[in-house]
Interface confidence: medium
Amino acid sequence: LPAQVAFTPYAPEPGSTCRLREYYDQTAQMCCAKCPPGQYVKHFCNKTSDTVCADCEASMYTQVWNQFRTCLSCSSSCTTDQVEIRACTKQQNRVCACEAGRYCALKTHSGSCRQCMRLSKCGPGFGVASSRAPNGNVLCKACAPGTFSDTTSSTDVCRPHRICSILAIPGNASTDAVCAPES
């Protein structure tokens, strides 16, 4: 940049890029200031005056330094099966997460949840795996030899069979072992 040019708006050397937190306005042919998070462009710059920024209105936000003509609308309020983990402010969108016992079946670009679903339940003979499905739902796995699950649950894992000094009934995937009474 020419040495005398320091403050926006300024005409950059043809073909050069503007500095951080500036944008090139094709109409003004100038490098102009971007607006900070929480604000938007009320008036674009011209040859003699810089960008005029204004605060986002209620339920609106901008998250980055920007040259947006309007702020973005915050997502609608969280539904009854969700909890708000981040509120809508001038600088960030609302983020909703699913309440306990549910998973997010449909996510927004910002990582908030649009639709929650009840977690799958694993029936007898199956326990909840340590890893989740890509969508966050429960994965069920058959109980391995020596383990069992006798419940229908979205949280219970396969548990080891009890160890008996004298075995009455061997355990299987869905029932625990039964020990004989000791004499």
Partner: antibody, heavy 116, light 107 residues
Framework: QIQLVQSGAEVKKPGASVKVSCKAS????????MSWVRQAPGQGLEWMGW????????TYADDFKGRFAFTLDTSTSTAYMELRSLRSDDTAVYYC?????????WGQGTLVTVSS | EIVMTQSPATLSLSPGERATLSCKAS??????VSWYQQKPGQAPRLLIY???NRYTGIPARFSGSGSATDFTLTISSLQPEDFAVYYC?????????FGQGTKLEIK
């Protein structure tokens, strides 16, 4: 490297239309405005107007309103200048040029000859 | 519209001499003036932008000065390749306009 490559020379009859293309490469097409400049044989440069390459909004000099149209295909980084109802005094070299303030890159020019 | 008037229309000089080209605007254009060089059969080439800023790769013998309505392009010591047509142009207000050109020829 930055290049603006224009379509080839055209010979047209009066009343016809012509569409000149200008394919840009080597830079982000939607960052810089695209100007169009006309130069009649043996004459000086005339600024025809420009098109905002991000919004697609054209601006025309008064002498170039009506029969002229600037358009874009951002998917191919190409600007177009269409001229309708050609007249003999439209015979000229037409240049596309990057930017408005200090036009730093120019196409090679497209000669449009209007002759019956 | 703003009229850019260049003088002289033709300038005849020898290599090694100093060339001074003038451009006058009919209204104040601040410093929104560029200078271009054009050789026969070629597109114009940007020399100076913002009235006095030499564009990347342009030799130091080219310099620009002026503001408001009076602008000057100076070539301190003419080289054989400098003989061409020179145009000034304003980009301050629509429509942007060019001068009619100054032809710099070998004496």
């Amino acid at each position: 490297q930055i290049q603006l490559v224009q379509s080839g020379a055209e010979v047209k009859k009066p009343g016809a239309s012509v569409k000149v293309s200008c394919k840009a490469s080597g830079y982000t097409f939607t960052t810089y405005g695209m100007s169009w400049v006309r130069q009649a044989p043996g004459q000086g440069l005339e600024w025809m107007g420009w098109i905002h390459t991000y919004s697609g909004v054209p601006t025309y000099a008064d002498d170039f309103k009506g029969r002229f149209a600037f358009t874009l295909d951002t998917s191919t980084s190409t600007a177009y200048m269409e001229l309708r109802s050609l007249r003999s005094d439209d015979t000229a070299v037409y240049y596309c040029a990057r930017g408005l303030y200090g036009v730093d890159y120019w196409g090679q020019g497209t000669l449009v000859t209007v002759s019956s | 519209e703003i009229v850019m008037t260049q003088s002289p229309a033709t300038l005849s000089l020898s290599p090694g001499e100093r060339a001074t080209l003038s451009c006058k605007a009919s209204e104040n254009v601040v410093t929104y003036v560029s200078w271009y060089q054009q050789k026969p059969g070629q597109a114009p080439r940007l020399l100076i932008y913002g009235a006095s800023n030499r564009y990347t790769g342009i030799p130091a013998r080219f310099s620009g000065s002026g503001s408001a309505t009076d602008f000057t392009l100076t070539i301190s010591s003419l080289q054989p390749e400098d003989f061409a047509v020179y145009y000034c142009g304003q980009s301050y207000t629509y429509p942007y306009t060019f001068g009619q050109g100054t032809k710099l020829e070998i004496k």
